[in-house]
């Protein structure tokens, strides 16, 4: 004979647990139904009546099967530096993530509590590590034979073009200028980065440090006992 199916509420067998989507009510000493996501327990069960569930009110939610007396409040609206990647519904909390060009400086369980703008590397410096959702851009000074003439959170140090005749040698923040109409070899996008000849490297001077409001994880140039944050702008 098939085992008889017990309907909630029911008293569990000694030593056994309640079934999936049920909970044990200590007061009634019965196995009772949980409420589905998007609902909460309006009336708890008794020995003779099951849990009465009700829908969550606006701006509240429950994500799991539950027997909570009140739904949870959704988080506050996303700030101007954030985008809402998940709306507040009866079944899920609002999730705010940082908008493009920003990263999460302080995360919470889901989404981000505090966004900060990605560091921009100033001319003479290129990106050494791109920003991620949770980490800032890292800048580095452009090595001999390379340059960056932009203030950017994405641009790398690019190789100088190589001239037949150099009008103005390149440096860390400026490409070489050729006298002839076209250089002998210009690094095309996606081209292999080749180390530059020594003659090109000797013309290179490091960009001079400038104080910055950027956090101390930015690139540091040695310039005394406590150098300022380097190679980036604070905005």
């Amino acid at each position: 004979l098939p085992a008889q199916v017990a309907f909630t509420p029911y008293a569990p067998e000694p030593g056994s647990t309640c079934r999936l989507r049920e909970y044990y009510d200590q007061t009634a000493q019965m196995c009772c139904s949980k409420c589905s996501p998007g609902q909460h327990a309006k009336v708890f069960c008794t020995k003779t009546s099951d849990t009465v569930c009700d829908s969550c009110e606006d701006s509240t939610y429950t994500q799991l099967w539950n027997w909570v007396p009140e739904c949870l409040s959704c988080g506050s609206r996303c700030s101007s530096d954030q985008v809402e990647t998940q709306a507040c519904t009866r079944e899920q909390n609002r999730i705010c993530t940082c908008r493009p060009g920003w990263y999460c400086a302080l995360s919470k369980q889901e989404g981000c509590r505090l966004c900060a703008p990605l560091r921009k590397c100033r001319p003479g410096f290129g990106v050494a590590r791109p920003g991620t959702e949770t980490s800032d851009v890292v800048c580095k000074p452009c090595a001999p034979g390379t340059f960056s003439n932009t203030t950017s959170s994405t641009d790398i140090c690019r190789p100088h073009q190589i001239c037949n005749v150099v009008a103005i040698p390149g440096n860390a923040s400026m490409d070489a200028v050729c006298t002839s109409t076209s250089p002998t070899r210009s690094m095309a996008p996606g081209a292999v980065h080749l180390p530059q000849p020594v003659s090109t490297r000797s013309q290179h001077t490091q960009p001079t440090p400038e104080p910055s409001t950027a956090p101390s994880t930015s690139f540091l140039l040695p310039m005394g006992p406590s150098p300022p944050a380097e190679g980036s702008t604070g905005d």
Partner: antibody, heavy 118, light 107 residues
Framework: EVQLVETGGGLVQPGKSLKLTCATS????????MGWVRQSPEKQLEWVAQ??????????YYAESVKGRFTISRDDSESSVYLQMNSLKEEDTAIYYC?????????WGQGVVVTVSS | DIQMTQSPASLSASLGETVTIECRAS??????LAWYQQKPGNSPRLLIF???SLHTGVPSRFSGSGSGTQYSLKINSLQSEDVASYFC?????????FGSGIKLEIK
């Protein structure tokens, strides 16, 4: 959770080819600079190749020891990076690690063994 | 190419001790230095970048310092889980280059 999983390693004869694949998940692949670092049987780490992101027009970089023989490529839609290794030499024998994020490496795969021997 | 020199090849220290590991570049690398830890049978793991910035999730007993061509990694109050090889890497210029590594053991 960030994951980089390398496949395609194995035993190959000198002069032959092999293609390594690195499948990734758990981070924004399209922004990441991806690369390969190998570790010789003597445990020395050697950077092999790197490919940067679309915003920089996907520039590629190679160690002198593999230039002209190895080619790095990526597929942002598949969140994967590849290393095509041609004209393999016995000195290419190593564990090959897939790496990501910038000119230093936040993320590493578990590595795949490449053995070049006759 | 920029050469990175780490010596000696191995180092032995007692638990609780402070250990300093050195790395020298063949030319100025302007703090473009990262440190990695590799435990036996595992992949390397980033500890430090920009010579002195601690990577997310790395215990604060690890610290990096240095400038120019001389850099060091310091481990305060050595723990048994710190038994590993430690590699430095310069990223100031391509090709990116690693030091030969230092194997740290417990006395």
């Amino acid at each position: 959770e960030v994951q980089l999983v390398e496949t395609g390693g194995g035993l190959v004869q000198p002069g032959k080819s092999l293609k390594l694949t690195c499948a990734t998940s758990g981070f924004t692949f399209s922004n990441a600079w991806m690369g390969w670092v190998r570790q010789s049987p003597e445990k020395q780490l050697e950077w092999v190749a790197q490919i940067k992101d679309k915003s920089n027009n996907y520039p590629t970089y190679y160690a002198e020891s593999v230039k002209g023989r190895f080619t790095i490529s990526r597929d942002d839609s598949e969140s994967s990076v590849y290393l095509q290794m041609n004209s393999l030499k016995e000195e290419d024998t190593a564990i090959y690690y897939c790496t990501g994020y910038g000119d230093f490496f936040d993320y590493w795969g578990q590595g795949v063994v490449v053995t070049v021997s006759s | 190419d920029i050469q990175m020199t780490q010596s000696p090849a191995s180092l032995s220290a007692s638990l609780g001790e402070t250990v300093t590991i050195e790395c020298r570049a063949s030319e100025d690398i302007y703090n473009g230095l990262a440190w990695y830890q590799q435990k036996p049978g595992n992949s390397p793991r980033l500890l430090i970048f920009n010579a002195n910035s601690l990577h997310t999730g790395v215990p604060s007993r690890f610290s990096g310092s240095g400038s120019g061509t001389q850099y060091s990694l310091k481990i305060n109050s050595l723990q048994s889980e710190d038994v590993a090889s430690y590699f430095c890497q310069q990223y100031y210029d391509h090709p990116l280059t690693f030091g030969s590594g230092i194997k740290l053991e417990i006395k």
